[in-house]
């Protein structure tokens, strides 16, 4: 018998190491997810690690390469798209990022049947957007702000629009504000289900004021970037929706879809388009004052070749306590009768739930209910509706997938994911094949992420698609921080928080506290997800306690909390962070002389206001790319929550809620202000104005700018940023380097 002395165990423990900043910056502990690219009920494509495009057939268990990495490499392709008739693949290369979603690229078409690239009538370059029709192999693409159509890849193109002009008229793609704040896509065109029609948006930005900033590059003179960007209260884009028959595009040309009268009477937005059938389309519109949304169902009139949107098919959604919807107005999921639909909106108790609308919104049948929220409808089949919610065990920061049987009465509900890997997996999303024959579950945590494949009928797990084994092994000798998610009850408000604690945390000791805040309307920071990031390192190596708190204005806990910030941004979000800090101090393990706060974007705004709150709670803090005045931010986002900056509306609070107005209060804190000079989203102007106000008030502060960097501060700037912030915090907390 060999006795193992206990010191062997100790020496094993000694091999455990803390996270380093280098680990984080190198992405050493990043995870992988697996989202199948479904092409039928039982087949999906996946780009393998060695860049082959592989088709997997779930039922045969077979896989084969449909496009080799050699072909991909021949045009330096990084992405692909198979035509629905499976004859062609577009290959995407020369990716060039524009804004958050948009990019341009070069496209090549590969003919699978003939094993060669399509020559003749090649696509122009660079293309702003390209997509296959849902059936066959028609192509629609946007080039120089105009839309083109090809009946077959080798055919000459048919030009649909002619008025496209840079920064003036956008066809089939959104302008800056629609991309970022309304559609959240790089495209603004939609094929009908069988490819008969193509709908598209035209955005006219002619009268929009332009934001201009220098891009320094490395030429003798900097370039000026000009973007039509409507700030709060400014002139907005004018949107029109057109539909063209793609079989006979020249016959009557594009037909405009009428805007509902109650919408067209004042400034408005188009918010989304959903095809129901080839001859029925659903458009959603929103008043500029975003508490009224209209869903309009339109039908094709063969005799007139026009689109008719009867008033009887208009459904109004209105909020009396805030804005319409959550972050966006939800989109409908139509049922098989092609007229009734399922949609998430607030119930009478102020919780967002699934409703079934057959004739009028007033007669909607509520499908889910409770003091929790339905978050996303994934799929509706003949007999099931799949959705996600945060119902399980009353944790708002979880996501589980549920199935409601709609084919039987009364409908029965089953949680598909709640008990699968309960400790590891509490935050899921899903991806469904045609007819929900199979689906993939992607679990984001709190344990190491895992992606699995399931039978859509029985919910049985078929196989693991990605389990991040390498990551699991790499983490075996790492001292990760402990995480806990709990709640504080304060004055009838529930404040959920996540606390990240050093590995050897001892409640009897005192630790420096860093608050990480975002806090924007309809956001959620306290989520049961896996992450090894900068704050993990700060807890693991530097011995800090980090806390994230979801205060008023955050999402998925009902309208009372969500709409509390309506027309009053910058007040309750800050109050709730401060309240939480006071509660954390009461817990006894926080060194109240070493408390900091940091945030990015909206979080930079909140952290700045918290530092300038005059409470004396914070020793120091960091604002990265902060908003400093709501007059400087985008109309669509800002006015949703703040109304208009006019005397007869909400100008007073626009003025009261600036960071600059509190410049004096920064005198007793150490403030680090950081911004990219080429930030197209939260303009550098915001930080320039903070700096000017602080200088004018003769308040000392630290600052860092990142030349030619946007809102994401990516690439080498990321390393510099986190290194710089680490030094700042360690100095603030008197931690040795």
């Amino acid at each position: 018998i060999v006795l193992r002395p206990s010191r062997v165990h100790n020496s094993e423990e000694n091999t455990m190491r803390a996270l380093t900043l280098k680990d984080i910056l190198n992405g050493t502990f990043s995870y992988k997810t697996f989202f199948p690219n479904w092409i039928s009920g039982q087949e999906y494509l996946h780009q393998s690690a060695d860049n082959n495009i592989v088709l997997y057939n779930i039922e045969t268990g077979q896989s084969y390469t449909i496009l080799s990495n050699r072909t991909m490499k021949s045009v330096n392709a990084s992405n692909y798209g198979l035509s629905p008739d499976r004859q062609f693949v577009y290959l995407e290369s020369d990716y060039s990022k524009l804004w958050r979603y948009s990019y341009t690229a070069t496209y090549y078409i590969y003919d699978l049947s003939n094993g060669e690239f399509v020559r003749g009538n090649e696509l122009p370059r660079p293309i702003q957007y390209l997509c296959w029709s849902p059936v066959g192999s028609k192509l629609a693409y946007v080039y120089q702000n105009n839309i083109y159509l090809k009946q077959r890849p080798g055919d000459p193109p048919f030009q649909i629009t002619f008025n496209g002009r840079e920064n003036k008229i956008f066809n089939g793609i959104p302008d800056w504000v629609y991309e970022e704040e309304m559609l959240a896509t790089k495209y603004a065109l939609w094929w009908s289900p069988n490819g008969k029609f193509l709908a598209y948006a035209e955005f006219n930005d002619t009268d929009i004021p332009v934001i201009a900033y220098s891009y320094y590059g490395d030429e003798q003179y900097p370039r000026t970037i000009n973007i039509p960007y409507p700030k709060a209260g400014a002139k907005n884009p004018v949107v029109r929706i057109f539909i063209i028959d793609t079989t006979y595009p020249a016959y009557v040309g594009p037909q405009e879809v009428p805007v509902p009268a109650m919408i067209a009477s004042s400034d408005y937005y188009f918010s989304w388009l959903t095809w129901v059938t080839d001859e029925r389309v659903c458009l959603q519109w929103l008043k500029r004052v975003q508490n009224v949304s209209v869903l309009s169902i339109c039908d094709f009139r063969e005799d007139w070749q026009t689109w008719d949107c009867p008033k009887t098919q208009e459904h109004i959604e209105e909020s009396r306590t805030g804005w319409a919807g959550g972050f966006f107005v939800s989109t409908p999921v139509f049922s098989y009768d092609a007229i009734s639909y399922y949609k998430i909106f607030s119930d009478k108790d102020g919780y967002k739930h699934i409703h079934y609308i057959k004739d009028t919104v007033e007669n909607a049948i509520q499908i889910t209910s409770g003091k929790w929220e339905a978050i996303n409808i994934f799929r509706v089949t003949q007999d099931s509706l799949f959705y996600s919610s945060n119902e399980f065990e009353e944790y708002p920061g979880r996501r589980n997938i549920y199935r409601i049987s709609i084919g039987s009465y009364p409908p029965s509900k089953k949680c598909v994911t709640c008990h699968l890997r309960k400790e590891r997996c509490q935050y899921y999303t899903a991806s469904f094949s045609d007819y929900a024959k199979y689906y993939a579950l992607v679990c984001y945590g709190p344990g190491i992420p895992i992606s699995t494949l399931h039978d859509g009928r029985t919910d049985q797990e078929i196989k693991i698609l990605e389990e991040n084994k390498e990551l699991e092994n790499a983490l075996k000798n790492i001292q990760l921080p402990k995480e806990e998610i709990k709640k504080l009850e304060v004055d009838e408000i529930t404040l959920w928080y996540k606390m990240i604690l050093p590995p050897q945390f001892d409640r009897s000791k005192k630790y420096p506290l860093l608050i990480q805040v975002y806090g924007g309307p309809c956001s959620q920071s306290v989520r049961s997800v896996f992450a090894v990031n900068w704050i993990s390192y700060l807890a693991s190596k530097e011995g800090m306690v980090i806390a994230l708190v979801d205060g008023r204005g955050t999402a998925f806990q009902g309208d009372k909390l969500l709409y509390a910030v309506y027309r009053k941004l910058g007040v309750y979000e800050v109050e709730d962070q401060i309240t939480a800090v006071r509660k954390f101090i009461e817990m006894g393990f926080i060194d109240e002389k070493r408390i900091a706060i940091w945030g990015w974007s909206y979080g930079g705004y909140v952290s700045s206001l918290a530092l300038a709150s005059g409470t004396g709670l914070f020793k120091c803090g960091i604002a990265v790319a902060p908003v400093s005045s709501w007059e400087y931010y985008a109309s669509v986002y800002t006015e949703r929550f703040m109304g208009l900056p006019t005397k007869d509306d909400n100008l007073e609070h626009y003025k009261n809620s600036t960071v600059m107005a509190r410049a004096e209060y920064f005198r007793n804190v150490d403030y680090l202000l950081i911004h990219g000079t080429a930030d197209d989203n939260v303009h550098f102007q915001n930080s320039a104005q903070i700096a000017k106000a602080l200088v004018n008030a003769q308040v000392d502060f630290q600052a860092m700018w990142y030349s030619d960097q946007n809102h994401g501060l990516s690439g080498l700037s990321t390393n510099h940023l986190y290194t710089h912030m680490t030094h700042f915090l360690k100095q603030c907390f008197s931690l040795s380097d």
Partner: nanobody
Framework: DVQLVESGGGLVQPGGSLRLSCVAS????????MAWYRQVPGKRRELVAG???????NYADFVGGRFTISRDNAKNGLYLQLNGLKPEDTAAYYC?????????WGQGTQVTVSS
């Protein structure tokens, strides 16, 4: 290894019909997506019709409801019923996986439509 053998072609008058067959030697699962393709000499091979393991079908625009793709899982067979044939349907017809695999093109079966 699977080999695909096509048959059933021939000479037919305009408006006439044919039934093409494709039999797989070796085990071919009924869950495989399969398709019929055709090629006119000097032109590119093109899809005629495809069928998934789940029975979903896809037809080229030129088919216009004249052809029907089907399969017989028991016999390991894939079929294409050609009705209302036109002179422009004259071509060599091939079966293959859907999307096609470069190593699986057979000899094909010739269909000639002429009066």
């Amino acid at each position: 290894d699977v080999q695909l053998v096509e048959s059933g072609g021939g000479l037919v008058q305009p408006g006439g019909s044919l039934r093409l067959s494709c039999v797989a030697s070796g085990r071919l699962s009924s869950s495989n997506s399969m398709a019929w393709y055709r090629q006119v000499p000097g032109k590119r091979r093109e899809l005629v019709a495809g069928i998934t393991g789940g029975g979903e079908t896809n037809y080229a625009d030129f088919v216009g409801g004249r052809f029907t793709i089907s399969r017989d899982n028991a016999k390991n067979g894939l079929y294409l019923q050609l009705n209302g044939l036109k002179p422009e349907d004259t071509a060599a017809y091939y079966c293959n996986f859907w999307p096609p695999l470069i190593n699986y093109w057979g000899q094909g079966t010739q269909v000639t439509v002429s009066s």
